[in-house]
Interface confidence: low
């Protein structure tokens, strides 16, 4: 085992168990979590004479580690005087010791309050030449306190001389005012009046506000991804609830079922954003089967400062279905930039809106922030599309030049996933386009020969296709450009992807 | 495929400190998230912290917090968990893993798709 120094705990009573007529008083000292034996606990009694009794050390049973207590009894004015208890341990270093002082009982006492308050800014909205920050420590037992500003967590060096304290009744209070430049004001930087009182810590912060003014609490109920749905079959949904002012009141979310039928257990998080706000997210797991069949979940959020309860409900999307069209293909190179390589995936034509693009590589699904993908949005028709981006390394297409860009669809079939394999060199490429749709059609446009089979290899051109405008007359996505070989004497092929 | 091959396990008493190496003996890590898992004895193998393929966000198990860092060197293929104030409980094989389904599921042993042998961790 290594050798741990002791942590020295001081041992007292409450002053208010202590009869006004006691004689003599015990206090101890206790030191715990050291290695190896011995430690020595000498106490300073001032003035006072007192008997010490130092109980043998006990193993905790878990570390191994040794613990003992030593105990001092004082008779006398023992009251108004403070005693040190000090505990060396040789072991840890020769001159290692740990001085405690404190007095026989601990008071009850009411903690203080902190708060901090800043100048206005003038009628105009502006910051003047300088800001005022005021920390006021309120409501607490009359003692001892320390005030210390901190500058993003950072000691300030501050004239605490204009401190003042003020007693109404039972109870102080203090405050302490920190000028600032408007230029510190503005940089940004969080301000912290933080209190010592009692060996307790205290604090409240601030800083700029953000320059627009805060909107009101605002909530938000996500449906499943269809990659967590029918993939992964294990489906979640998510409450946020935004823009919450940091208090004292609870953040309540509550979930229910329209059947009536018991929810799983949620998971909470939340989160203080950059611009001093809170976000408060809970996350369900729902039954696959309960999903799909419809039922409807709702998400109820209530605070003490909101007027009322925020209501948010999702179920499944109605209306028609329609499975994602898939385009894969990817850039050629670029000057400078031989080690690297884009590759773009439309999806088209899908409804309802929801789905999950996924990019795959030797048969792995990549983490999602390899890839950047649109939001869905509408077409000129009534389906939706999306593009997803993805940077190659030269590293990873030598090792094996064929990507995939799968769409997790609810209407996609047969196992509700579409994809498409695209190669950085089409020529090169060892793999075919692992599709579970058909391969795309190549479009003859000559005399009766419509619609014949493309080889199944990625969405690349043919080698002597040239790009030209879509022409209505040309079967296919009318907003796809299309390629056309111009071979002579050859019935003209089109390619149905991106120019 | 990528191969992971962890090391930097052994006994320690309570209250000291490891540092756990997971580096790719076949393959790059570089574009990957890694996850590191754990397994006691007679327990399921759970989830202990993940970072991502960039390195600028992490994730950590309530258990850990505070005391486990997760960090990684893809220059040298490699992702370190340092293990500070170790408990008797943190006794486990301790697993490195790619993580197959990106940011969701991080926590889920069946979003990860290759696995390291393992290394013993022992706190006494």
């Known amino acids: 085992a290594s050798t741990q120094s002791p942590s020295v705990f001081p041992l007292t009573r409450c002053c208010k168990n202590i009869p006004s007529n006691a004689t003599s008083v015990t206090l101890g000292c206790l030191a715990t979590g050291y290695f190896p034996e011995p430690v020595m606990v000498t106490w300073d009694t001032g003035s006072l004479n007192g008997t010490t009794m130092t109980l043998p050390a006990t193993t905790l049973t878990l570390s191994g580690h040794y613990a003992t207590i030593s105990l001092l009894t004082v008779s006398g004015a023992w009251a108004k005087q403070m005693f040190t208890c000090r505990v060396a341990h040789t072991p840890s270093s020769t001159d290692w010791v740990d001085n405690k002082t404190f007095s026989v009982c601990s008071r009850d006492f009411t903690p203080p309050t902190v708060k901090i308050l800043q100048s206005s800014c003038d009628g105009g909205g502006h910051f003047p030449p300088t800001i005022q920050l005021l920390c006021l420590v309120s409501g607490y037992t009359p003692g001892t306190i320390n005030i210390t500003w901190l500058e993003d967590g950072q000691v300030m060096d501050v004239d605490l001389s204009t401190a003042s304290t003020t007693q109404e009744g039972e109870l102080a209070s203090t405050q302490s005012e920190l000028t600032l430049s408007q230029k510190h004001w503005l940089s940004d930087r969080t301000y912290t009046c933080q209190v010592t009182y009692q060996g307790h810590t205290f604090e409240d912060s601030t800083k700029k506000c953000a320059d627009s003014n805060p909107r009101g609490v605002s909530a938000y109920l996500s449906r499943p991804s269809p990659f967590d749905l029918f993939i992964r079959k294990s489906p979640t949904i998510t409450c946020l609830v935004v823009d919450l002012a940091p208090s004292k009141g609870t953040v309540n979310l509550t979930w229910s079922r329209a059947s009536g039928k018991p929810v799983n257990h949620s998971t909470r998080k939340e989160e203080k954003q950059r611009n001093g706000t809170l976000t408060v997210t809970s996350t369900l797991p729902v039954g696959t089967r309960d999903w799909i069949e419809g039922e409807t979940y709702q998400c109820r959020v209530t605070h003490p400062h909101l007027p009322r309860a925020l209501m948010r409900s999702t179920t499944k999307t109605s209306g028609p279905r329609a499975a994602p069209e898939v385009y894969a293909f990817a850039t050629p190179e670029w000057p400078g930039s031989r080690d690297k390589r884009t590759l773009a995936c439309l999806i088209q034509n899908f409804m309802p809106e929801d789905i999950s693009v996924q990019w795959l590589h030797n048969e792995v699904q990549l983490p999602d922030a390899r890839h950047s993908t649109t939001q869905p949005r509408k077409t000129k028709g009534s389906g939706f599309f999306v593009f997803s981006r993805l940077e190659v390394t030269r590293a990873e297409w030598e090792q094996k030049d064929e990507f995939i860009c799968r769409a997790v669809h609810e209407a996609a079939s047969p196992s509700q996933t579409v994809q498409r394999a695209v190669s950085v060199n089409p020529g090169l490429a060892g793999g075919s386009a692992q599709s579970q749709r058909a391969p795309d059609r190549v479009l003859c446009h000559s005399g009766q020969q419509q619609g014949l089979p493309r080889a199944a290899g990625g969405s690349v051109p043919h080698p002597r296709c040239h790009c030209g405008a879509g022409r209505a007359d040309w079967p296919g996505p009318p907003e796809l450009d299309v390629c056309v070989e111009e071979a002579e004497g050859e019935a003209p092929w089109t390619w149905t992807g991106l120019c | 495929d990528v191969q992971l091959q962890e090391s930097g396990g052994g006994l320690v008493q309570a209250g000291g400190s490891l540092k756990l190496s997971c580096a790719a003996s076949?393959?790059?890590?570089?574009?990957?998230?890694v996850a590191w898992f754990r397994q006691a004895p007679g327990k399921e193998r759970s989830f202990v912290t993940r970072i991502s393929w960039s390195g600028t966000t992490s994730y950590y198990a309530d258990a850990v917090k505070g005391r486990f860092a997760i960090s990684r060197d893809n220059a040298k293929n490699t992702v370190y968990l340092q293990m500070n104030s170790l408990k008797p409980e943190d006794t486990a094989v301790y697993y490195c893993?790619?993580?197959?389904?990106?940011?969701?599921?991080?926590?889920?042993?069946?979003?990860?798709?290759?696995w390291g042998q393992g290394t013993q961790v022992t706190v006494s």
């Open positions: 076949r393959g790059s890590l570089s574009r990957w998230d």
């Open positions: 893993a790619v993580a197959l389904y990106g940011n969701r599921g991080y926590y889920d042993v069946n979003a990860h798709s290759y």
